[in-house]
């Protein structure tokens, strides 16, 4: 089942997911000055069953110069287009998603396609969070989001991370303020505040967290 | 929570225009496309054509370039269309969607008379 | 453009029975179709997108299946809120078209 919105937004990150469940969708979007062909799909599917999945549909992006189509739109700032959810500063390391039943890998790119991936998450994924380059995490808790179905609606959870600036100066746990979940309370209420300057150990915790949820994922 | 708030309903004179709009919340606006759909008693659900936001592009289906026009207002998360020369075949309720199908508005009612 | 029908305009079932829409596409269309269910003076509501991968919130008694030309949406285990118009559609090809519809009548 398809989640009704997208993983939260999170100041200063990035989310990524190791693998797609099936049913997701990535939508063909185009790099500027490219478009969809009209004929081409909408989006890539994740599709299959419990022992293979792929991809299916291929996305086609044509110059848009070549079509008649007028821009009535008003344009967005690229500053603005800060969080890429598929582009990782230091790419964390993945799993074998060939051993994750039901699962896609991550699709590989398509002639001129832009350069932010749109993906629909179903029921069940998760995505991991990550501070972009020239800022450091705060840890209260996983950087990392679910996407849970409860009373027959979807809802993210809320990844306990804070990306600062390094020129900043952290606060100390003390004096921290807690990170809400939509519920207005921390979802890890025992969860203690972990400050890590190293890049590479975030990584690495974050891959080694990773295999750990998909396997528990199907317990 | 991801939503598609359409304009309120039109009472219009034939041979005028009308424009209405849809606006988005809940979603990265300039993210997905937004279509727009008629649906008029007896003639089913037509594909107007949609516009990407944040691409700048448009797309009309052929039988109804000319009638309609598609924009987006990226400042303000919203899309319009706009119906022109209106007669009574235009009289129906519109749909803006988006999400890949999965959000409808609530509709718009269009009624041309004189 | 792709045409799509529905061929059956009305279907009557009862509460507990199990009951198929059929759709076909006038060309091939892969997996790129959408079911939808329309209540009376409600807005479509998207059920299944992809020929049978079902949207959030809507009950498994819901299935969609086919491919290529052929599509079904079987109901199983009708409820009576189930009374609704249900018209598929394909985005495969553009323009996008829509079936006619088939309304579900509870007995």
């Known amino acids: 089942e398809l989640c009704d919105d997208d993983p939260p937004e999170i100041p200063h990150a990035t989310f990524k997911a190791m693998a797609y469940k099936e049913g997701t969708m990535l939508n063909c979007e185009c790099k500027r000055g490219f478009r969809r062909i009209k004929s081409g799909s909408l989006y890539m599917l994740c599709t299959g069953n419990s022992s293979h999945s792929s991809w299916d549909n291929q996305c086609q992006c044509t110059s848009s110069a070549t079509r008649n189509t007028t821009k009535q739109v008003t344009p967005q700032p690229e500053e603005q287009k800060e969080r890429k959810t598929t582009e990782m500063q230091s790419p964390m390391q993945p799993v074998d998603q060939a051993s994750l039943p039901g699962h896609c890998r991550e699709p590989p790119p398509w002639e001129n396609e832009a350069t932010e991936r749109i993906y629909h998450f179903v029921v069940g994924q998760m995505v991991y969070y990550q501070c972009v380059q020239g800022y450091r995490a705060l840890h209260r808790g996983p950087a990392e989001s679910v996407c849970k179905m409860t009373h027959g609606k979807t809802r993210w959870t809320q990844p306990q991370l804070i990306c600062t600036g390094e020129m900043e100066t952290s606060q100390f746990p003390g004096e921290e303020k807690p990170q809400a979940s939509p519920e207005g309370r921390p979802e890890s209420e025992t969860s203690c505040l972990v400050t890590t300057t190293d890049f590479q150990i975030q990584t690495e915790m974050a891959a080694t967290m990773e295999t750990s949820i998909f396997t528990t994922e199907y317990q | 929570q991801v939503q598609l708030q359409q304009s309120g309903a039109e009472l219009v004179r034939p041979g005028t225009s009308v424009k209405m709009s849809c606006k988005a919340a809940g979603y990265t606006f300039t993210n997905y496309w937004i279509g727009w759909v008629k649906q008029r008693p007896g003639h089913g659900l037509e594909w107007i054509g949609d516009i990407h936001p944040g691409g700048g592009y448009i797309d009309y289906n052929e039988k109804f370039t000319g009638k309609a026009t598609l924009t987006a207002d990226t400042s303000s998360s919203t899309a319009y269309m706009q119906l022109s020369s209106l007669t009574s075949e235009d009289s129906a309720i519109y749909y803006c969607?988006?999400?890949?199908?999965?959000?409808w508005g609530q509709g718009t009612l269009v009624t041309v008379s004189a | 453009d792709t045409t799509v029908t529905q061929s059956q305009k009305f279907m009557s079932t009862s509460v507990g029975d199990r009951v198929s829409v059929t759709c076909k596409a006038s060309q091939n269309v892969g997996t790129n179709v959408a079911w939808y269910q329309q209540k009376p003076g409600q807005s479509p509501k998207a059920l299944i997108y992809?020929?049978?991968y079902r949207y959030s919130g809507v009950p498994d008694r819901f299935t969609g299946s086919g491919s290529g030309t052929d599509f079904t949406l079987t109901i199983s285990n009708v409820q009576s809120e189930d009374l609704a118009e249900y018209f598929c559609?394909?985005?495969?090809?553009?323009?996008?078209?829509f079936g006619g519809g088939t309304k579900l009548e509870i007995k």
């Open positions: 992809s020929a049978s």
């Open positions: 969607v988006s999400r890949n199908f999965a959000k």
């Open positions: 559609q394909q985005y495969n090809s553009y323009p996008y078209t």
